[in-house]
């Protein structure tokens, strides 16, 4: 259940997809990745106010209990709902190879 | 990839399964659930320090970028890796029914 997509905190403040530019050095990949030299990393960032993009029943429960016990139960968290694959050219023992990673770039976000 | 399960912050401080006791009133379910009257809600709570229970490559990237840009990129977040089903006795228009929810109780946790 993808609940409300209206952000009560103002435009762009709630859980959504952001792009962060990162070099191989930033990612700690310089020693095993040849290309690309820079990655447009898509990730999920933003607040998860009550019922905003609630992923499932668990997220709805978490919202209710966070309201009651904010020191014990954290608010839901903005995480990937799905991923886009990414291809890297990697260094290997025998040379180089293409490797596809299915869990590297966020495609869509929700709160859980 | 489930990376390190050793918590550098001290016992019980990192992402793990917690149980929070909640009444139907706490959950806002009193008007549509008959039983159970109280739920032992299992949820994922705790910090996600570098590579602790990293769910996948995305979590590893997030850790690296959070170190570099802590104001822009949040640390990974402790969320359910899997769920246990839970059966509720619900009120319906015609009486009551058993309903199983697959996404209500966290079974296992990871950082993402």
């Amino acid at each position: 259940a993808r609940n409300g997509d209206h952000c009560p905190l103002g435009p762009g403040r709630c859980c959504r997809l952001h792009t962060v530019r990162a070099s191989l050095e930033d990612l700690g990949w310089a020693d095993w990745v040849l290309s690309p030299r820079e990655v447009q990393v898509t990730m999920c960032i933003g607040a998860c106010p009550s019922q905003f993009r609630a992923a499932n029943m668990h997220a709805q429960i978490k919202t209710s209990l966070h309201r009651l016990k904010p020191d014990t139960v954290p608010a839901p968290c903005c995480v990937p709902a799905s991923y886009n694959p990414m291809v890297l050219i990697q260094k290997t023992d025998t040379g180089v190879s293409l490797q596809t990673y299915d869990d590297l770039l966020a495609k869509d976000c929700h709160c859980i | 990839a489930r990376n390190g399960d050793h918590c550098p912050l001290g016992p019980g401080r990192c992402c793990r399964l917690h149980t929070v006791r909640a009444s139907l009133e706490d959950l806002g379910w009193a008007d549509w659930v008959l039983s159970p009257r109280e739920v032992q809600v299992t949820m994922c709570i705790g910090a996600c320090p570098s590579q602790f229970r990293a769910a996948n490559m995305h979590a590893q990237i997030k850790t690296s970028l959070h170190r570099l840009k802590p104001d822009t990129v949040p640390a990974p977040c402790c969320v359910p890796a899997s769920y246990n089903p839970m059966v509720l006795i619900q009120k319906t228009d015609t009486g009551v029914s058993l309903q199983t929810y697959d996404d209500l109780l966290a079974k296992d946790c990871h950082c993402i």
Epitope: S35, P36, Q40, T42, N84, P85, M86, V87, L88, I89, L98, L105, K107 | -
Partner: nanobody, 123 residues
Framework: QVQLVESGGGLVQPGGSLRLSCAAS????????IGWFRQAPGKGREGVSC????????YYSDSVKGRFTTSRDNAKNTVYLQMNSLKPEDTAVYYC????????????????WGQGTQVTVSS
């Protein structure tokens, strides 16, 4: 109209060969890196090979290395994927994509895509 069109797919027995073509119209392939991808039922898109624009360097995934070869014929504005020693696990829809960045071509980036050609390896 700018487009990529794949052809050459079909049904082949294990151990057999196929040659896929990726023909461009409306733009010149010379300046583009060309990636071949495949998508098996219920799976994500996997990068199979890439040929760079400048020096024609080629890159392959471990799963096809030594069996698949990619080449380009700039005069025909076409890139080929020669597939030998085919296995049942090579069964998928095969796509080509063109991108102005160096290899690897990445599926989440907006660039030119073909519509795909089905390859089925079965006895």
């Amino acid at each position: 109209q700018v487009q990529l069109v794949e052809s050459g797919g079909g049904l082949v027995q294990p151990g057999g060969s196929l040659r896929l073509s990726c023909a461009a119209s409306g733009f010149t392939l010379d300046y583009y890196a060309i990636g071949w991808f495949r998508q098996a039922p219920g799976k994500g898109r996997e990068g199979v090979s890439c040929i760079s624009s400048n020096d024609g360097s080629t890159y392959y995934s471990d799963s096809v290395k030594g069996r698949f070869t990619t080449s380009r014929d700039n005069a025909k504005n076409t890139v080929y994927l020669q597939m030998n020693s085919l296995k049942p696990e090579d069964t998928a829809v095969y796509y080509c994509a063109a991108d102005l960045t160096p290899c690897p071509v990445n599926p989440s980036v907006d660039h030119y895509w073909g519509q795909g050609t089905q390859v089925t390896v079965s006895s």
